[in-house]
């Protein structure tokens, strides 16, 4: 099966790599603009230069293109705990990330929030914290994992998942409650 090509891709595929079809004259192939620049005017004819201009401050193009406008630089989202790793340049968008000992949680493809890596108190580190994944903890006996923290089995209610892990403790508590003095 032939993949469906959009109009722009169809137009571009007729020209050799690094060139695009002139929008008003499909017999002319114009040279694309370098990254960091955008298309100001199409080339007037074959073998003639495309008029490319450098992106203005606050905008960029990261690859060769024939865009009429540069793309706006992304802003790091302070409300999500993001920090700027590297600032925007004419040929590269802003790079946002998290502080040391934090990881990224992606709520959607293009939205992440920074959270502190778990320290595994009352447990051991099974897998260290990574850029996009929290620490994986293994809890000590008498503790169970809840929201990636090791919580005492004394906080385990019968209705919760922790009952299997905390079964001996729950039985002990139940036994203590049941054994009344006569």
């Amino acid at each position: 099966l032939v993949p469906h090509l959009g109009d722009r891709e169809k137009r571009d595929s007729v020209c050799p790599q690094g060139k695009y079809i002139h929008p008003q004259n499909n017999s002319i192939c114009c040279t694309k603009c370098h990254k960091g620049t955008y298309l100001y005017n199409d080339c007037p004819g074959p073998g003639q230069d495309t008029d490319c201009r450098e992106c203005e401050s606050g905008s960029f193009t990261a690859s060769e293109n024939h865009l009429r406008h540069c793309l706006s630089c992304s802003k790091c989202r302070k409300e999500m705990g993001q920090v700027e790793i590297s600032s925007c340049t004419v040929d590269r968008d802003t790079v946002c990330g998290c502080r040391k000992n934090q990881y990224r949680h992606y709520w959607s493809e293009n939205l992440f929030q920074c959270f502190n890596c778990s320290l595994c108190l009352n447990g051991t580190v099974h897998l260290s914290c990574q850029e996009k994944q929290n620490t994986v903890c293994t809890c000590h006996a008498g503790f169970f994992l809840r929201e990636n923290e090791c919580v005492s089995c004394s906080n385990c209610k019968k209705s919760l998942e922790c009952t299997k892990l905390c079964l001996p403790q729950i039985e002990n508590v139940k036994g203590t409650e049941d054994s009344g003095t006569t």
Epitope: R77, K78, E79, M80, H105, W107, Q113, F115, N116, N134, E147, N148
Partner: nanobody, 119 residues
Framework: EVQLLESGGGLIQPGGSLRLSCAAS????????MVWVRQAPGKGLEWVSH????????YYADPVKGRFTISRDNSRNTLYLQMNSLRSEDTAVYYC????????????RGQGTLVTVSS
Amino acid sequence: EVQLLESGGGLIQPGGSLRLSCAASGFTFAHETMVWVRQAPGKGLEWVSHIDRVGQDTYYADPVKGRFTISRDNSRNTLYLQMNSLRSEDTAVYYCAVLPKRGPWFDYRGQGTLVTVSS
């Protein structure tokens, strides 16, 4: 006790508009970034939009960009979601929530309001 109470949902025809509200109490509303998430039938929770404490910075997920507007009134402790040009794929239960701080789960989320977009 933190309470979040959504309202404004209902049955609406494609192309129509709705305004959802979320009344907040039990915490300092003006200190928190607020979020709208939704859950379509048989699907997981989807981030829709959020707004920072002062209402300056907003975010919209791609499927709702240009159609939905999030706002807040800190004097009334209320969060809003204006939904225009509604589509059948917007059918979901809409929840308002406080932006999580400790980890990727919602400690404080409302009971939700159902939005059904159908002709």
